[in-house]
């Protein structure tokens, strides 16, 4: 690792669309790119009516937004397509949803986030 | 440094085949997807074939499937399109194009284009 | 497939301008979404990927937003050789599909 971040090598590898495009559905993925960029995995996926649909995970380009992230997490509220991304090998296994809460006026009533969803 | 020189294209009868060649050099060739791109004359880019880092996984655009095939032999730093049935609306400049994942196919390197006319 | 629309297909800018294209994809594309930039005679070059990561390279005054279906590229302050066509270009399903592209010209 380098100045102690954990650098990723591999990444989980699914793909709901292995037929069409003729890939393997899930195992591992090695991730290459050149020696000045930096590696993460990533998973995107789907809830519909309350069921979690993943629909890829693998390695993602050097990306700032995935920086220093040890976990998965999406954080934008309610999008269409979940996205998250992480680094370190096989970070993208379990993957959440925890959006940010935009905070307009403090208030003495804490607010609870959305629960989670967890591959 | 990143070079993608392609190679092959020319004038060509409709029915007629080519087969064009990308030479890769300045990075490890079997480490990353590569694609060809085609843009016909004054027209926009159009994604033609896309090939992982060690040639498992393969796609193509529907304009082209059955017809061309994409290849790449990594011992010779080599991509190939194989164009067979060629027809008028294929004439365009080709492209090869670099990408890190089969998944994230953001185009990072491009050669600068080889011209393949289809004309009788 | 998945339909990218730009817009507009050309405008005309002064050197010194901010310039703004946009493009909508025809369903969810989450952050699958790229910049290219293309002079005449030349290859295209990456310019943003991932929707707001710069490629090696590309300047500052170049940046991405957007998510999910639309997508912006703002030139903050439009240089001469910044005067080209540019594509935005999705990666999220098979088979990639490029925008129609925005050509920028000189005013």
């Known amino acids: 690792a380098i100045l102690g971040r954990s650098e990723t090598q591999e990444c989980l590898f699914f793909n709901a669309n292995w037929e069409k495009d003729r890939t393997n559905q899930t195992g591992v993925e090695p991730c290459y790119g050149d020696k000045d960029k930096r590696r993460h995995c990533f998973a995107t996926w789907k809830n519909i009516s309350g069921s979690i649909e993943i629909v890829k995970q693998g390695c993602w380009l050097d990306d700032i937004n995935c920086y220093d992230r040890t976990d998965c997490v999406e954080k934008k509220d309610s999008p269409e397509v979940y996205f998250c991304c992480c680094e370190g090998n096989m970070c993208n296994e379990k993957f959440s949803y925890f959006p940010e809460m935009e905070v307009t006026q403090p208030t003495s009533n804490p607010v609870t986030p959305k629960p989670p969803y967890y591959n | 440094e990143v070079q993608l020189l392609e190679s092959g294209g020319g004038l060509v009868q409709p029915g007629g085949s080519l087969r064009l060649s990308c030479a890769a050099s300045?990075?490890?060739?079997?480490?990353?997807?590569m694609n060809w791109v085609r843009q016909a004359p004054g027209k926009g880019l159009e994604w033609v074939a896309g090939?992982?880092?060690?040639?498992?996984?393969?796609g193509y655009a529907d304009s082209v499937k059955g017809r061309f095939t994409i290849s790449r032999d990594n011992s010779k730093n080599t991509l190939y399109l194989q164009m067979n049935s060629l027809r008028a609306e294929d004439t365009a400049v080709y492209y090869c194009?670099?990408?890190?994942?089969?998944?994230?196919?953001?185009?990072?390197?491009w050669g600068q284009g080889t011209l393949v006319t289809v004309s009788s | 497939d998945i339909q990218m629309t730009q817009s507009p297909s050309s405008l005309s800018a002064s050197v010194g301008d901010r310039v703004t294209i946009t493009c909508r994809a025809s369903?969810?594309?989450?952050?699958?979404l790229n910049w290219y930039q293309q002079k005449p005679g030349k290859a295209p070059k990456l310019l943003i990927y991932?929707?707001?990561s710069r490629a090696s390279g590309v300047p500052s005054r170049f940046s991405g937003s957007g998510s999910g279906t639309d997508f912006t590229l703002t030139i903050s302050s439009l240089q001469p050789e910044d005067f080209a066509t540019y594509y935005c270009?999705?990666?999220?399903?098979?088979?990639?599909?490029f925008g129609g592209g925005t050509k920028v010209e000189i005013k």
């Open positions: 194009a670099r990408s890190a994942n089969w998944h994230d196919t953001a185009l990072d390197y």
């Open positions: 270009q999705q990666s999220y399903d098979s088979p990639l599909t």
């Open positions: 090939i992982n880092y060690n040639g498992g996984y393969k």
């Open positions: 300045g990075f490890t060739f079997s480490s990353y997807g």
């Open positions: 991932a929707v707001t």
């Open positions: 369903q969810s594309i989450s952050n699958y």
